[in-house]
């Protein structure tokens, strides 16, 4: 014998209290698949969470974070405070990156500058708290008689297309 609940579509629940009628989900609840015996409570985006997608009868709400915070975890299960570039978040708040480390994002940890000498290269541009060092050609490449290195193309100004 077919389960009468199997015909209940998403957005409804098979209501045993009411003779297994396929009852539409009550407010602030949803069922994303058919044949459900209950509707799930909608996620509420409160505090540092804000609503990215409203809950419907067939799908849960989706949250992201208010400005100054970013999502962590599956489905944005947590919001973590943003820091400035050149900082990392510690238990005591945002702290500047130590000398020799950098962070070019508003999240995550400070990472050590690249050690150019490990690749046999020299430092072309020094690192900062916000930027990694830029490694240049190896000293041997710059010795007299070595093939000339093509200089990098000049950076275009934003908004200008090549002629």
């Amino acid at each position: 014998l077919q389960d009468p609940c199997s015909n209940c579509p998403a957005g409804t629940f098979c209501d045993n209290n009411r003779n297994q009628i396929c009852s539409p989900c009550p407010p602030n609840s949803f069922s994303s698949a058919g044949g459900q015996r209950t509707c799930d409570i909608c996620r509420q985006c409160k505090g540092v969470f804000r609503t990215r997608k409203e809950c419907s009868s067939t799908s849960n709400a989706e949250c992201d974070c208010t400005p100054g915070f970013h999502c962590l975890g599956a489905g944005c299960s947590m919001c973590e405070q943003d820091c400035k570039q050149g900082q990392e978040l510690t238990k005591k708040g945002c702290k500047d990156c130590c000398f020799g480390t950098f962070n070019d994002q508003k999240r995550g940890i400070c990472r050590p500058w690249t050690n150019c000498s490990l690749d046999g290269k020299s430092v072309l541009v020094n690192g900062t708290k916000e930027r990694d060092v830029v490694c240049g050609p190896s000293p041997a490449d710059l010795s007299p008689g070595a093939s000339s290195v093509t200089p990098p193309a000049p950076a275009r100004e934003p908004g200008h297309s090549p002629q």
Epitope: N19, C22, S23
Partner: antibody, heavy 118, light 112 residues
Framework: QVQLVQSGAEVKKPGASVKVSCKAS????????MHWVRQAPGQRLEWMGW????????KYSQDFQGRVSITRDTSASTAYMELSSLKSEDMAIYYC???????????WGQGTVVTVSS | DIVMTQSPLSLPVTPGEPASISCRSS???????????LGWYLQKPGQSPQLLIY???HRASGVPDRFSGSGSGTDFTLKISRVEAEDVGVYYC?????????FGQGTKLEIK
């Protein structure tokens, strides 16, 4: 927009049957239960039964058990209510109503007047 | 069957004044999901009923906020904060928790 349009008025003799139709539009017909409610002159509203979403499973009020049949044609998005062995007390306006939110009839048909007269 | 009893049966109101209708059920209308399965409907003269309040206190889409529902268990109330001429008609409560679903006998609201 979401609406339910019912068939026209009927005049029937005692002992006969009447079949009222209710055509749904503007929504997915099989996603919502359809209920039937009647109102005799000067009386309160009286629930007759429902047809379940998708499956066509039905439940009837004991007061009409054996005399009422609720069916549906999903391809035509239409629900039907047939009442047999009509009596003068069955003279009423018959409404179809969608249960669009939990436990509530959010859309009603315009009603079908059924007169039972010899 | 669950018996629904409304009071008053007739309610003359001056426009702009508040109005209150009571509905009592012979059994508790609390569903296992925590909602009270009680609805309020208005049937205007010559029209089909229309949903006002569902699950005890949730206003239906498009219903003016002067209508509010409250109560739990067996005692429920529909309040109209300021009655308008268009509110005239018969108000019904209905329980959709247990078959057969049953309606109150209706409260006729009229303008003084």
């Amino acid at each position: 927009q979401v609406q339910l349009v019912q068939s026209g008025a009927e005049v029937k003799k005692p002992g006969a049957s009447v079949k009222v139709s209710c055509k749904a539009s503007g929504y997915t017909f099989t996603n919502y239960p359809m209920h039937w409610v009647r109102q005799a002159p000067g009386q309160r509203l009286e629930w007759m039964g429902w047809s379940n979403a998708g499956s066509g499973n039905t439940k009837y009020s004991q007061d009409f058990q054996g005399r009422v049949s609720i069916t549906r044609d999903t391809s035509a998005s239409t629900a039907y209510m047939e009442l047999s062995s009509l009596k003068s007390e069955d003279m009423a306006i018959y409404y179809c109503a969608r249960e669009g939110v939990a436990g509530a009839f959010d859309i009603w048909g315009q009603g079908t007047v059924v007169t039972v007269s010899s | 069957d669950i018996v629904m009893t409304q009071s008053p049966l007739s309610l003359p109101v001056t426009p702009g004044e508040p109005a209150s209708i009571s509905c009592r059920s012979s059994q508790r209308l609390l569903h296992s999901n925590g909602f009270n399965y009680l609805g309020w409907y208005l049937q205007k003269p010559g029209q089909s009923p229309q949903l006002l309040i569902y699950l005890g206190s949730h206003r239906a889409s498009g219903v003016p906020d002067r209508f509010s529902g409250s109560g739990s268990g067996t005692d429920f109330t529909l309040k109209i904060s300021r009655v308008e001429a268009e509110d005239v008609g018969v108000y019904y409560c209905m329980q959709p928790l247990q078959i057969p679903y049953t309606f109150g006998q209706g409260t006729k609201l009229e303008i003084k």
